[in-house]
C-alpha cells in the first residue's frame, strides 16, 4: 500500500493590526509540535479591511461590525473549521487610537468595546482588543524581523535562503513608520541606555538582549503632514498656502477644523482669519525638506546624544530593516533597491517632487489622488527622519534595508505580538529537536 501523510498537526493564530489609516488581519500558521522552534511560524494570509482606521468610527461605532466582517469571514474560510475554536484572535490598536485616547478615554473605550463585541461573535478564541504602547510596537517589530531572519537561532534555519544574509547572529534594528507614529528599535553596541523608558531587556532562546526603543507619537507620515501644514499656515499671509511638498499645479482645500482636530497640531494652533485654506503645490524638494526639519527640535538634549525633541538615541549600530510605510512609500517611488545610494535617493526625490501634478496623475492613473498627492511629502519626510532625525549618514544608508516581507511574512509588529502572547519564544534554548512534522505511516 502507498504511504499516506498523516493529517497536518498545525495551529493557527490571528492578529488584527488596527492602525491609524487602516486595519489589517494576519493569519499565522505553525506546526504544533515545533512550537518552541525559531522560524517555524509563517503568515498564510493578509486581509486589508476595506476602509479607514477604527478611530474614524468614533461617531458611528455601530458600523464597526460591518467594517470588520469581510476579513473575519476570510479567516473563517482560510482556517479549517476543526481549528476555529482553538485559534486565538488578538487585536492591537496603535497610534491612531493612542491619539483618540488622549482626546477622550471614554470614546476610545467605546470604540474598543464595540470592536470586542464584534470579534466575540466569531467562532475563534477571542483574546481581547487593546491599545498597545509605542514601546511594545517597537519591541514586537524588532522581534518579528529578527525571528523571520533567523537571528535568534543557533542551529540551521528552517528556510534555505535568508535575504539580507549576514554571517553572524547580530540582530537587525527595526525602523517602523505608520500613519501616526514611528518607532526605532535596536541593540546598541556596548552602550548604556541613558533613559530607562527606552530600555528593554529580553532573554530569548538562551541569550540576553539589551534593546533600545522609542516611539515618536505624531511623527507617523500622516500626522507629520498635519503638523507641517499647521506650522506653515501660521506664517501664511492669506488663505493660500504655497507648499513645496506637493507637486506644481496641485490644489486642495483644507478645513481649519480638520487641521486642528488631531492632538498632534495643538502646539501650532492659533486663531486664523479664515475657515479654509488652499494648498497650492510648488514641488521643491529642498524647501520641503527644510520645512520638515522645523518639526524636529534638535536644540535641546539632556543626554549624550539625542534623536530630536530631547529623546535619547544611542549611536546607530548594525543593519536595520525599515518596514511598513518606510517600505510602501519607497517601493512606490522605486527606491527600495540595495544599490541605490542616499545621494541617488535624494536626486530622485528632487525630480519626482518637481513633476507637474497633471503629469503625475496621468502616469499613475490607477492610484487614488489623495495617496498619490502625498508621495512627494512622504518620501521627503522619510529622508528627513532617517538622516536628520535618526542620524543616518550617506555611508550608513547602505545598512538600511527596505523590507516588505521576509519569507512571505509581512514585517511589522503583529507576528512578534502573537509569538509573545502565545508563549512561543522561550527564554531558554529548547533542549531537544522535536520530530519533523512530515511524519509518514
Amino acid at each position: 500500500t502507498q504511504n499516506k501523510a498523516l493529517p497536518e498537526n498545525v495551529k493557527y493564530g490571528i492578529v488584527l493590526d488596527a492602525g491609524s489609516s487602516h486595519t489589517s488581519l494576519y493569519i499565522y500558521k505553525w506546526p504544533a509540535e515545533k512550537e518552541n522552534d525559531t522560524g517555524v511560524v509563517h503568515q498564510v494570509e493578509e486581509c486589508r479591511v476595506k476602509g479607514p482606521g477604527i478611530s474614524k468610527f468614533v461617531q458611528k461605532v455601530n458600523e464597526i461590525g460591518i467594517y470588520l466582517t469581510d476579513c473575519m469571514e476570510r479567516a473563517r474560510e482560510v482556517i479549517p473549521r476543526s481549528q476555529h475554536q482553538e485559534t486565538p484572535v488578538y487585536l492591537g490598536a496603535t497610534a491612531g487610537m493612542r491619539l483618540l485616547r488622549m482626546e477622550s478615554e471614554e470614546l476610545a473605550d467605546r470604540v474598543l468595546d464595540v470592536v470586542e463585541r464584534s470579534l466575540s461573535n466569531y467562532p475563534f478564541d477571542f483574546q481581547g482588543a487593546r491599545i498597545i504602547t509605542g514601546q511594545e510596537e517597537g519591541a514586537y517589530g524588532w522581534i518579528t524581523i529578527n525571528y523571520l531572519l533567523g537571528k535568534f537561532s543557533q542551529k540551521t534555519r528552517w528556510f534555505s535562503i535568508v535575504p539580507y544574509e549576514t554571517n553572524n547572529q547580530e540582530t537587525f534594528g527595526a525602523l517602523d513608520l505608520g500613519g501616526a507614529s514611528t518607532q526605532v528599535t535596536f541593540v546598541p553596541q556596548n552602550q548604556t541606555i541613558e533613559s530607562p523608558d527606552n530600555a528593554l531587556q529580553f532573554r530569548l532562546y538562551g541569550k540576553d538582549y539589551n534593546v533600545y526603543t522609542h516611539s515618536f507619537l505624531c511623527y507617523g507620515k500622516d500626522q507629520a503632514l498635519w503638523q507641517k501644514l499647521a506650522k506653515d499656515i501660521q506664517v501664511a499671509s492669506n488663505e493660500i498656502l504655497r507648499d513645496p511638498c506637493f507637486h506644481p499645479g496641485y490644489k486642495k482645500v483644507v478645513n481649519v477644523s480638520d487641521l486642528y482636530k488631531t492632538p498632534c497640531t495643538k502646539r501650532f494652533e492659533m486663531t486664523l482669519p479664515f475657515q479654509q485654506f488652499e494648498i497650492q503645490g510648488i514641488g521643491n524638494y529642498q524647501q520641503c525638506h527644510q520645512s520638515i526639519l522645523e518639526l524636529f527640535n534638535t536644540s535641546y538634549c539632556p543626554y549624550s546624544q539625542c534623536a530630536f525633541n530631547g529623546i535619547f538615541l544611542p549611536p546607530l549600530q548594525g543593519d536595520f530593516g525599515a518596514f511598513s510605510a518606510f517600505y510602501f512609500v519607497m517601493k512606490f517611488l522605486n527606491l527600495t533597491s540595495e544599490k541605490v545610494s542616499q545621494e541617488k535617493v535624494t536626486e530622485m526625490m528632487k525630480k519626482f517632487c518637481a513633476q507637474p501634478w497633471e503629469e503625475i496623475k496621468t502616469s499613475y492613473a490607477g492610484v487614488k489622488e489623495k495617496y498619490l498627492s502625498e508621495y512627494c511629502f512622504s518620501g521627503t519626510y522619510i529622508l528627513s527622519l532617517l538622516l536628520q532625525g535618526y542620524h543616518f549618514t550617506a555611508d550608513s544608508w547602505e545598512h538600511i534595508h527596505f523590507i516588505g516581507k521576509i519569507q512571505g511574512s509581512d514585517a511589522g509588529w503583529t507576528l512578534g505580538y502573537m509569538l509573545n502572547l502565545t508563549n512561543m519564544i522561550p527564554a531558554e534554548q529548547p533542549l531537544s529537536t522535536p520530530l519533523s512534522h512530515s511524519t509518514y505511516v
Epitope: 476595506k50 476602509g51 487614488k368
Partner: antibody, heavy 120, light 106 residues
Framework: EIQVQQSGPELVKPGASVKVSCKAS????????MYWVKQSHGKSLEWIGF????????SYNQKFKGKATLTIDKSSSTAFMHLNSLTSEDSAVYYC?????????????WGQGTTLTVSS | QIVLTQSPAIMSASPGEKVTITCSAT?????MHWFRQKPGTSPKLWIY???NLASGVPARFSGSGSGTSYSLTISRMAAEDAATYYC?????????FGSGTKLEIT
C-alpha cells in the same frame, strides 16, 4: 468619482466560454474587493464570489465553483470573470460591484451589467 | 448558506400609504442591507447595516430588525418608490440575497 464600467453584451454558443470585464476608475484599484452577481431573467440576485485585488484572494459561492473564475489585471485596474462550459442556464445579466468604506462613509457601486445569451 | 425569504413577493400600495417589507433569515445575522432595483438598471444600495440610509435616499425610508427578522418601511408611499427591493446579508459566505419584493403603485 468612482465608476465601474462593464464590457458589452455577449451572444455565445452552448459549450463555449466567455470573459466578462469590469474596469474600475476613480479610486485605488487594490483598495476594495470586486464582487460578481448573477441575475437570471425576472429572477433574484445570486452572489458568485469576489476577488481582492490587493493580493488576488478569491472566494466563490459553492454553486459557481468550476463555472466562474475571477481574475484581475492591476495595471489596467480591470477585473475579469471567465465563465466556461456555457449552457442556457448561464444566460443572465452579470454585474460586478465594489463596496466598502471611503473614509468612514459606506458605499456600494455596481457596473451597468453585462447581458450574456447562450443560444445555438 | 443563509437563505433569506422576503414577503410579500409582490405588493401594491397607494400614494401616502405606509409600506413594510420583511426579510427572514434561516440563521441569525447581525445586520441586513437593502437594495432597490428598477427595470433595466443595476441594483442600488438603499439601506445599509440594518438602518442607515444610503446617500440620496429619502427620509421616508427606514430599516429595522435583528437576529433573523428584518424589515424595510416606507412611511408614505410615493410613485417613484415603485421598484423591486432585495435584502442582502454580508455576514457569512456566500453572501446571499432575498427573493425580492416587487412594489407597485396603485
Amino acid at each position: 468619482e468612482i465608476q465601474v464600467q462593464q464590457s458589452g453584451p455577449e451572444l455565445v454558443k452552448p459549450g463555449a466560454s466567455v470573459k466578462v470585464s469590469c474596469k474600475a476608475s476613480g479610486y485605488s484599484f487594490t483598495d476594495y474587493n470586486m464582487y460578481w452577481v448573477k441575475q437570471s431573467h425576472g429572477k433574484s440576485l445570486e452572489w458568485i464570489g469576489f476577488i481582492d485585488p490587493y493580493n488576488g484572494y478569491t472566494s466563490y459561492n459553492q454553486k459557481f465553483k468550476g463555472k466562474a473564475t475571477l481574475t484581475i489585471d492591476k495595471s489596467s485596474s480591470t477585473a475579469f470573470m471567465h465563465l466556461n462550459s456555457l449552457t442556457s442556464e448561464d444566460s443572465a445579466v452579470y454585474y460586478c460591484a465594489i463596496y466598502g468604506y471611503d473614509d468612514a462613509y459606506y458605499f456600494d457601486y455596481w457596473g451597468q451589467g453585462t447581458t450574456l445569451t447562450v443560444s445555438s | 448558506q443563509i437563505v433569506l425569504t422576503q414577503s410579500p413577493a409582490i405588493m401594491s400600495a397607494s400614494p401616502g400609504e405606509k409600506v413594510t417589507i420583511t426579510c427572514s433569515a434561516t440563521s441569525s445575522v447581525s445586520y441586513m442591507h437593502w437594495f432597490r432595483q428598477k427595470p433595466g438598471t443595476s441594483p442600488k444600495l438603499w439601506i445599509y447595516s440594518t438602518s442607515n440610509l444610503a446617500s440620496g435616499v429619502p427620509a421616508r425610508f427606514s430599516g429595522s430588525g435583528s437576529g433573523t427578522s428584518y424589515s424595510l418601511t416606507i412611511s408614505r408611499m410615493a410613485a417613484e418608490d415603485a421598484a423591486t427591493y432585495y435584502c442582502q446579508q454580508r455576514i457569512t459566505y456566500p453572501f446571499t440575497f432575498g427573493s425580492g419584493t416587487k412594489l407597485e403603485i396603485t
